[in-house]
């Protein structure tokens, strides 16, 4: 503790100039006085004055009145400071004396005669106020007040705390009354050393080192970082915890590029054909009749369907056709017969029976060949029966779909992953992207298809935290970290959610 | 009890970037209580506060060494790390990690045994 | 820039009080902390807050902070005491360090 007890002198009365002996001062009692604190105690002893004792230099001669003085020599109110703490009671012996030597430095003077002397014991509590007094014996009268001030930076009922007013890190605040802390505006601890963040900032998310400041952790983004930041690259998709990357409807993919549902996105069939989605970025387009081509973009001839029989031939016409019959044929089509079996119409050893009593006929045909009089060899590819693209190729009695690559099937109607083929070596991970496969390597392995032995691994010096699973290969910085639950941070390095004495952490 | 101990290379050549870590034991960098903060002391002089750093990551550094210098903190490890770049001869200091406690207006209550650093070619 | 200054060397008998000095502006509205260094050893803190002991410092280390100076006292000096001592307060948010004093016990 450190303080300081005041011990102002107001006025000194001696009108007859006598000594304490009776005796009487030439020319005048030159007055100076002698302070003594100490302790409390009953009955005053002589002893040391042991909480301090303070002289004056000659104040006036006989009766006169003291004035306040701040500075130099005869400073009044005299300042006896401590430091200790103020136990609440004290002894005070004021001493009046007459020096007939230096009036500066009277205490060093031989000769000194006692004038006279009070003694005050009891109890005082630290504060501003002055307490007065007056004190009178048969010759003298002496008028003072006094009080206890704590030092500066000293606080509390007996000076005992110590509090100095801070504006660093290692607090922001003002003392109280008391020696409390009181936080300046914007910080809050019990030193004042913890910032107030920006209101409504994300408690585990969000952190400050300043007042209504919001400053995100790593994965969080926003005001207040209460929003999370979704996978890298990641399309068309959202999270929920920082580097997720969800996908929309539709959509799928590591990084939600791979459109599921093209047919909606996209509409590529063409003049009205029925479009199905197969797989990312895969569809295919039912054609109605009259149209071909991937996406049934191209209309066919009206004579493509061969609507003409019995060898007639067909001549386009504007949104019609005409056939032209050969001999012994008629119709639209050139369905009727004028003919018989006894004119042999039946080519390529095809059988002749008689029909309508013998008015038409109908022949049976050999194998490979077709037609009313089994004019035509059989050509299996005329239906289209090869889907998405495949070429049709005909092979004696059969027929074969010649797939582009990415289908399969006997008319090349099922889609074949790209992963299929498993093109990723070491034991990469495949996913299928629009543009090929695209391999997720193992560590220690990078290349499109993982057959590049890396010799400095990036994730040897293990630079995921928490037992956070290391891949290489999917981003710019050559690794990626896959947190455990209850871990964010692309190293996998906070803990989500501590208790609240951690004000920050995340 | 708590340690503080300094690791990093006892050579930097002039112009390079002198690192040093400091590991804690004994106790959790993560404390709200304290400031983890490098001191150094050329051979023959007295000590400079070079920066120090909370465990949330705020910083403050000594002004004169402002623009060389960068101290972290990596909690998962319990270590916080010092950078000095562009040394030059009178950089050759032992440099001290030091806990810096609150509940003392600041005091470094605990110090690191020290690691003297040379800076020469 | 704020600065703490020490009288560079202090002799004092063993058994006797030593004092050491460290002044700067207004030092005594800022928290003062004293460090020992022995040759060798890293610093330890004797005194923080001015006048407080940290536990396991002898109470013959008392220190005191007023007006431009801060004092540490060391009563009944004892041969052990014989160190560098190392004045340091805080100036905003930067630490600061006075340049030392060698004490030596005579004897």
């Known amino acids: 503790g450190s303080g300081i007890f005041q011990l102002r002198l107001q006025e000194f009365v001696n009108q007859r100039g006598m000594l304490a002996n009776g005796q009487s001062c030439e020319p005048g009692c030159r007055t100076f006085f002698r302070i003594c604190l100490k302790h409390f105690q009953a009955t005053f002893s002589e002893g040391p004055c042991t909480f301090g004792n303070v002289s004056t230099p000659v104040l006036g001669t006989n009766s006169f009145v003291v004035r306040d003085k701040n500075s130099g020599s005869g400073r009044n109110p005299l300042q006896l400071p401590f430091n200790f703490t103020w136990p609440g009671t004290f002894s005070l012996n004021i001493q009046a004396w007459h020096t007939p030597g230096d009036d500066l430095r009277p205490e060093t003077s031989p000769g000194n005669s006692l004038i006279s002397q009070i003694i005050i014991q009891g109890s005082l509590a630290v504060g501003k106020i002055w307490r007065t007094d007056e004190q009178n014996d048969t010759l003298t009268r002496l008028s003072y007040s006094y009080r206890v001030i704590c030092s500066d930076n000293y606080y509390g009922e007996s000076c005992s705390r110590l509090c100095k007013k801070r504006d660093d890190h290692f607090g922001h605040y003002e003392c109280q009354p008391d020696g409390s802390l009181s936080c300046l505006p914007g910080w809050t601890g019990k030193y004042c050393d913890q910032p107030i963040c920006l209101s409504g900032c994300h408690e585990q998310n969000g952190y400050c080192s300043k007042p209504d400041e919001c400053i995100c952790r790593p994965g969080w983004q926003g005001r207040l970082c209460n929003e999370c930041i979704p996978h890298n690259g990641c399309r068309h998709g959202t999270c929920s915890i920082p580097w997720q990357c969800a996908c929309d409807e539709g959509w799928g993919g590591l990084f939600c590029d791979q459109d599921l549902n093209y047919c909606t996105h996209h509409s590529p069939c063409k003049n009205g054909s029925t479009c199905s989605n197969s797989g990312p970025k895969g569809y295919t387009c039912t054609c109605l009749p009259g149209y071909t081509g991937e996406h049934c973009e191209l209309g066919l001839s009206k004579c493509a369907s061969n609507p003409c029989r019995n060898g007639g031939s067909c001549k386009d016409q504007e949104n019609s056709y005409h056939c032209l019959c050969p001999p012994g044929y008629y119709g639209q089509h050139c369905e009727h017969s004028t003919l018989t079996c006894a004119d042999s119409p039946c080519f390529n050893g095809g059988s002749c029976r008689e029909r309508n009593q013998g008015s038409s006929y109908a022949c049976e045909c050999p194998p490979n060949f077709t037609g009313s009089n089994c004019e035509k060899k059989v050509d299996r590819c005329t239906s289209n029966p090869c889907a998405n693209g495949g070429q049709c190729q005909n092979r004696g009695p059969s027929r074969t779909c010649r797939c582009r690559p990415g289908f399969t099937g006997t008319h090349c109607e099922l889609h074949i992953s790209d992963c299929a083929r498993s093109p990723c070596a070491h034991g990469g991970t495949c996913h299928d992207l629009e543009n090929g496969p695209v391999c997720t390597c193992p560590a220690g392995f990078s290349g499109r298809r993982c057959e590049v032995r890396i010799t400095h691994d990036a994730c040897a010096s293990g630079p995921c935290f928490n037992g956070a699973t290391c891949y290489t290969g999917l981003s710019p910085n050559n690794f990626v970290c896959n947190c455990p639950y209850g871990f964010v941070g692309s190293r996998c390095e906070f803990p989500v959610g501590l208790p609240p004495s951690f004000p920050w952490v995340a | 009890e708590v340690q503080l101990q300094e690791s990093g290379p006892g050579l930097v050549k002039p112009s390079e970037t002198l690192s040093l870590t400091c590991t804690v034991s004994g106790g959790s960098i993560s404390s709200s209580s304290y400031y983890w903060g490098w001191i150094r002391q050329p051979p023959g002089k007295g000590l400079e506060w070079i920066g120090d750093?909370?465990?949330?990551?705020?910083?403050y550094y000594n002004p004169s060494l402002k623009s060389r210098v960068t101290i972290s903190v990596d909690t998962s490890k319990n270590q916080f790390s010092l950078k000095l770049s562009s040394v030059t001869a009178a950089d050759t200091a032992v440099y001290y990690c030091?806990?810096?406690?609150?509940?003392?207006?600041?005091?470094?209550?605990?110090w690191g045994q020290g690691t003297l650093v040379t800076v020469s070619s | 820039s704020y600065e703490l200054t020490q009288p560079p060397s202090v002799s004092v008998s063993p058994g006797q009080t030593a004092s050491i000095t460290c002044s700067g502006q207004?030092?005594?509205?800022?928290?003062a902390s004293w460090y020992q260094q022995k040759p060798g050893q890293s610093p330890v803190l004797v005194i923080y807050?001015?006048?407080k002991r940290p536990s396991g410092i002898p109470e013959r280390f008392s220190g005191s902070n007023s007006g431009d100076t801060a004092t540490l006292t060391i009563s009944g000096t004892q041969p052990m005491d014989e160190a560098d001592y190392y004045c340091?307060?805080?100036?905003?948010?930067?630490?600061?360090f006075g340049g030392g004093t060698k004490l030596t016990v005579l004897g």
């Open positions: 030091a806990r810096q406690a609150l509940a003392m207006g600041g005091g470094s209550d605990k």
């Open positions: 207004r030092l005594g509205d800022k928290y």
């Open positions: 750093i909370y465990y949330t990551g705020s910083t």
């Open positions: 340091q307060a805080w100036d905003r948010d930067t630490g600061v």
């Open positions: 807050e001015d006048s």
